[in-house]
Interface confidence: low
Amino acid sequence: IPVIEPSVPELVVKPGATVTLRCVGNGSVEWDGPPSPHWTLYSDGSSSILSTNNATFQNTGTYRCTEPGDPLGGSAAIHLYVKDPARPWNVLAQEVVVFEDQDALLPCLLTDPVLEAGVSLVRVRGRPLMRHTNYSFSPWHGFTIHRAKFIQSQDYQCSALMGGRKVMSISIRLKVQKVIPGPPALTLVPAELVRIRGEAAQIVCSASSVDVNFDVFLQHNNTKLAIPQQSDFHNNRYQKVLTLNLDQVDFQHAGNYSCVASNVQGKHSTSMFFRVVESAYLNLSSEQNLIQEVTVGEGLNLKVMVEAYPGLQGFNWTYLGPFSDHQPEPKLANATTKDTYRHTFTLSLPRLKPSEAGRYSFLARNPGGWRALTFELTLRYPPEVSVIWTFINGSGTLLCAASGYPQPNVTWLQCSGHTDRCDEAQVLQVWDDPYPEVLSQEPFHKVTVQSLLTVETLEHNQTYECRAHNSVGSGSWAFIPISAGAHTHPPDEFLFTP
């Protein structure tokens, strides 16, 4: 480690004095100190002498001697005070720039250590420091404002009490720069735009940042637009706004518009699409099939997507029959806006009743006219079955009627004993009727089919069962011949409540 002579940490001299600082090391040595006049440097191998014959207050400062060849980077320092009764301060820099939350050193060096007790930091024009300014003082280095804030960007002066009066330093301007977190924040309004040819339009591109140094521009299909910029400082942010006003749009104005802002941290951009159309439009669509089948008692939501410009002037859901003249309750109709020109309309049909099957139409109107989209809702029912004994063309016949939707399939079973329902162990014979006769098949109604089983002689200790099933469920009816006549009944479990 180099050694400085005189071997004291501080040296106090008067203006005009001769000062000689000698540094000796193992190898070559170098001096480092505040830039000040009148110093002469003599180097001689492993020693270096810094001297002046006329010390001034500007020589006040810390002088450090280093040995560049020393791998440990050792150094020695001495602080020189040149105590000038007229000049209590030596200001090393008149402008200090730091980022927010860094410590800011205002380098006003005290020229006389005796004055330390009476020093203070003030703002120019005799103003006190802002409240909550946290600072400390070192006679060797000056005042340090800790964790400086942007609002502390001020002109400061160091004050010392000399003979009962305050003597100020020249001013030091502190610039506290905002830490820029990234590229400017951007907004481009609207996110999408549609206009009819000849209408007016406005597109607003705005950017904001904590720092004023950023650029913003609006481009149309990669062409930068020349638009006057409005600037403001609001809520501690700088804002720059570009407003494109089009009095009468035409097809050449359509296309992609990009708002681009950049600063030292990088670039942000956001885009929107402007569509120019010849006339008003209204398009209805649905992601659902327009033909819907739902089991009775269940619920269904019908959804219609609407794309329109200008906006809708009216819309409603209508039930077109064929059953009652009821209309959908308004509370079950819901509208949601996906964006400016696209909307979704939903009709909720909970716990569907038989009378609610049929056609549901969504109608919408805008200056482009009326449009409608119609759903056909068919209800699914499990089969209902009944069996009767009759004579057809002189032959004894069991007649089974099954009603449901979709169309039920029919199976006949003959089993031993008297029972409400044939089980596998009792079954003697099974007949599938591949083509039952369709008695009725109207839209939105149940399909009723009829199946005939010709029986030459009824066995009295046997049961004949007609079973019908479809995708929703099944139903059955057992026929038990009795000597006094035929007896028929459905199984106990057949109860249908929609």
Partner: antibody
Framework: EVQLVESGGGLVKPGGSLRLSCAAS????????MSWVRQAPGKGLEWVGR??????????DYAAPVKGRFTISRDDSKNTLYLQMNSLKTEDTAVHYC?????????????WGQGTMVTVSS | DIVMTQSPDSLAVSLGERATINCKSS????????????LAWYQQKPGQPPKLLIF???TRDSGVPDRFSGSGSGTDFTLTISSLQAEDVAVYYC?????????FGGGTKVEIK
């Protein structure tokens, strides 16, 4: 000593023009956001407009009644603020003050000139 | 624009008594990021320019007597003169500096009863 001194006021006919000046001293003018505030006889205070420091972009803002007719500019080398008033109307008759706020106070005005009277009359 | 409404228009108070002036802004002048209200109070005596009394709604400017105090937040603010002195006879204005255009209240004339 901190000081703002306005000049250039006087009598002018409706439709005429006038240029007000404001000489600043005793503080760092180039760092200041400078405003003009006016006061019609017997009335309250009305903000006219503002110019920011060059380091803050040097942009201007105006109150609606004067927008498009008045222009604020500054010459930092001369420590002078200007208000160019065109198309003057009788309702522009007022004492016009040059004012600024300590930088940290933003636009709370702690330094005011004595004002200069502008009279618009035929 | 933010509209500043002062009340009352005029106020007569005995020497040594308390004077209270209210100011209401049409929208909040509190900036949540630094929790500061961008509101100032001024005193104007005849033939003189206005003098800043209070900034940030409640901070007295240097040299302003401590009988002057400001309070309030958001949209409702109050200037209080705790003990009226003869030299306090003046017109008092509130002003928002939250956004441009900067706007002043209509003023409150304080007189001695």
């Amino acid at each position: 000593e901190v000081q703002l001194v306005e000049s250039g006021g006087g009598l002018v006919k409706p439709g005429g023009s006038l240029r007000l000046s404001c000489a600043a001293s005793g503080f760092t003018f180039s760092n200041a956001w400078m405003s003009w505030v006016r006061q019609a006889p017997g009335k309250g205070l009305e903000w006219v407009g503002r110019i920011k420091s060059k380091t803050d972009g040097g942009t201007t803002d105006y109150a609606a009644p004067v927008k498009g007719r008045f222009t604020i500019s500054r010459d930092d080398s001369k420590n002078t603020l200007y208000l160019q008033m065109n198309s003057l109307k009788t309702e522009d008759t007022a004492v016009h003050y040059c004012t600024t706020g300590d930088y940290s106070y933003t636009d709370a005005f702690d330094i005011w000139g004595q004002g200069t009277m502008v009279t618009v009359s035929s | 624009d933010i509209v500043m409404t002062q009340s009352p228009d005029s106020l007569a108070v005995s020497l040594g008594e308390r004077a209270t002036i209210n100011c209401k802004s049409s929208q909040s002048v509190l900036y949540s990021s630094n929790n500061k209200n961008y509101l100032a109070w001024y005193q104007q005596k005849p033939g003189q320019p206005p003098k800043l009394l209070i900034f940030w709604a409640s901070t007295r400017d240097s040299g302003v007597p401590d009988r002057f105090s400001g309070s309030g937040s958001g949209t409702d603010f109050t200037l209080t003169i705790s003990s009226l002195q003869a030299e306090d006879v003046a017109v008092y204005y509130c002003q928002q500096y939250y956004s441009t255009p900067l706007t002043f209240g209509g003023g409150t004339k304080v007189e001695i009863k």
